[in-house]
């Protein structure tokens, strides 16, 4: 399992660091989640050939996974701190149902899947403290989420494997884009 934020998982050359700023803490939290995703993807790719599949675009269209778009204000052109922060929090909230779906999808990395889910909840809390305009953040409807979860779990084995792969990959991409945008805030 990755080292929890606050401890260092990398080879740090300078051991005496100043206390982390809120931005650095968020950065570290995202990295921790990304480390967890990498471990989960390793198991997924070893278990099935989904990571090389050419049919993923087909399956991706049926999943409404959050993505960054120009209008979200997270890219350099048209960068807007508040709009972007709202998009990041909203996107993470939307990913939660997919992270719930992942919980029973791993054998050797069950703890890791739980750690990614719990760490994402913590990240959302960090970011909500940072946001000024919490009213603009739309929380997904629990009923809709419940039926989506049922639908995903009812898929055949191949589609479930593909869904797992796509969720992990999309979540990684979303976090990478978020991390870059958050540094500018």
């Amino acid at each position: 399992a990755p080292v929890p934020p606050g401890e260092d998982s990398k080879d740090v050359a300078a051991p005496h660091r100043q206390p982390l700023t809120s931005s650095e803490r968020i950065d570290k939290q995202i990295r921790y989640i990304l480390d967890g995703i990498s471990a989960l993807r390793k198991e997924t790719c070893n278990k099935s050939n989904m990571c090389e599949s050419s049919k993923e675009a087909l399956a991706e269209n049926n999943l409404n996974l959050p993505k960054m778009a120009e209008k979200d204000g997270c890219f350099q052109s048209g960068f807007n701190e508040e709009t972007c922060l709202v998009k990041i929090i909203t996107g993470l909230l939307e990913f939660e149902v997919y992270l719930e779906y992942l919980q029973n999808r791993f054998e050797s990395s069950e703890e890791q899947a739980r750690a990614v889910q719990m760490s994402t909840k913590v990240l959302i809390q960090f970011l909500q403290k940072k946001a000024k305009n919490l009213d603009a953040i739309t929380t997904p409807d629990p009923t809709t989420n419940a039926s989506l979860l049922t639908k995903l779990q009812a898929q055949n084995q191949w589609l479930q494997d593909m869904t797992t792969h796509l969720i992990l990959r999309s979540f990684k991409e979303f976090l990478q884009s978020s991390l870059r945008a958050l540094r500018q805030m």
């Epitope: 660091r17 650095e24 990684k172 870059r180």
Partner: antibody, heavy 116, light 107 residues
Framework: QVQLQQWGAGLLKPSETLSLTCAIY????????WSWIRQPPGKGLEWIGE???????NYNPSLKSRVNISVDTSKNQFSLKLTSVTAADTAVYYC??????????WGQGTMVTVSS | DIQMTQSPSSLSASVGDRVTITCRAS??????LAWYQQKPEKAPKSLIY???SLQSGVPSRFSGSGSGTDFTLTISSLQPEDFATYYC?????????FGQGTKVEIK
């Protein structure tokens, strides 16, 4: 072992368009940001811009009006176009990979000379 | 744009010397700073990221420190292969910017 291989015209006349391509071998294209960086002879490094697999770009404002970076995901390649070149654009041009932090993998560099 | 200023521009040192290069950002960049080594006719090579984290495969004689606006790259005991030009780079915001470089020459 991930490698970046780059190519393109090395000699241009003023007002022409610089065109370079970088191919990624042995690694995932989707999961990184891909940049172009240049270095005029005897000078320091200047970041030109970057692209993500989705096609979203970030450019250096000092060059933005003349730069276009595009991607061809089917070939694991990305390209740089710089229009209306002048002698000031003479430099070694590098492609590089950036994940979360530094540029950890670089192409071999292409010397581009602009001369009439 | 965030300006990155390195000092000194060049220095002469002997094998075994302790060498320190500093980099100053025109505004706070937290610890979002990288250091590179470049040898003549070669592409730069990443040494350190996040101000103090060593890139894998880089010898432990290289170390980085600093946060905010002031950063340092230290080579604890200079080796013959360390004679090169060193650059710092910030990745807090766009555009990504580099220091002007510090050339480490043989005394």
């Amino acid at each position: 072992q991930v490698q970046l291989q780059q190519w393109g015209a090395g000699l241009l006349k003023p007002s022409e368009t610089l065109s370079l391509t970088c191919a990624i071998y042995g690694g995932s294209f989707r999961e990184y940001y891909w940049s172009w960086i240049r270095q005029p002879p005897g000078k320091g490094l200047e970041w030109i811009g970057e692209i993500f697999h989705s096609g979203s770009t970030n450019y250096n404002p000092s060059l933005k009006s003349r730069v276009n970076i595009s991607v061809d995901t089917s070939k694991n390649q990305f390209s740089l176009k710089l229009t209306s070149v002048t002698a000031a654009d003479t430099a070694v041009y590098y492609c590089a990979r950036e994940e979360l932090d530094d540029f950890d993998i670089w192409g071999q560099g292409t010397m581009v000379t602009v001369s009439s | 744009d965030i300006q990155m200023t390195q000092s000194p521009s060049s220095l002469s040192a002997s094998v075994g010397d302790r060498v320190t290069i500093t980099c100053r950002a025109s505004q706070g960049i937290s610890s979002w700073l990288a250091w590179y080594q470049q040898k003549p006719e070669k592409a730069p090579k990443s040494l350190i990221y996040a101000a103090s984290s060593l890139q894998s495969g880089v010898p432990s004689r290289f170390s980085g420190s600093g946060s905010g606006t002031d950063f340092t790259l230290t080579i604890s005991s200079l080796q013959p292969e360390d004679f090169a030009t060193y650059y710092c780079q910030q990745y807090k915001s766009y555009p990504r910017t580099f220091g002007q470089g510090t050339k480490v020459e043989i005394k």
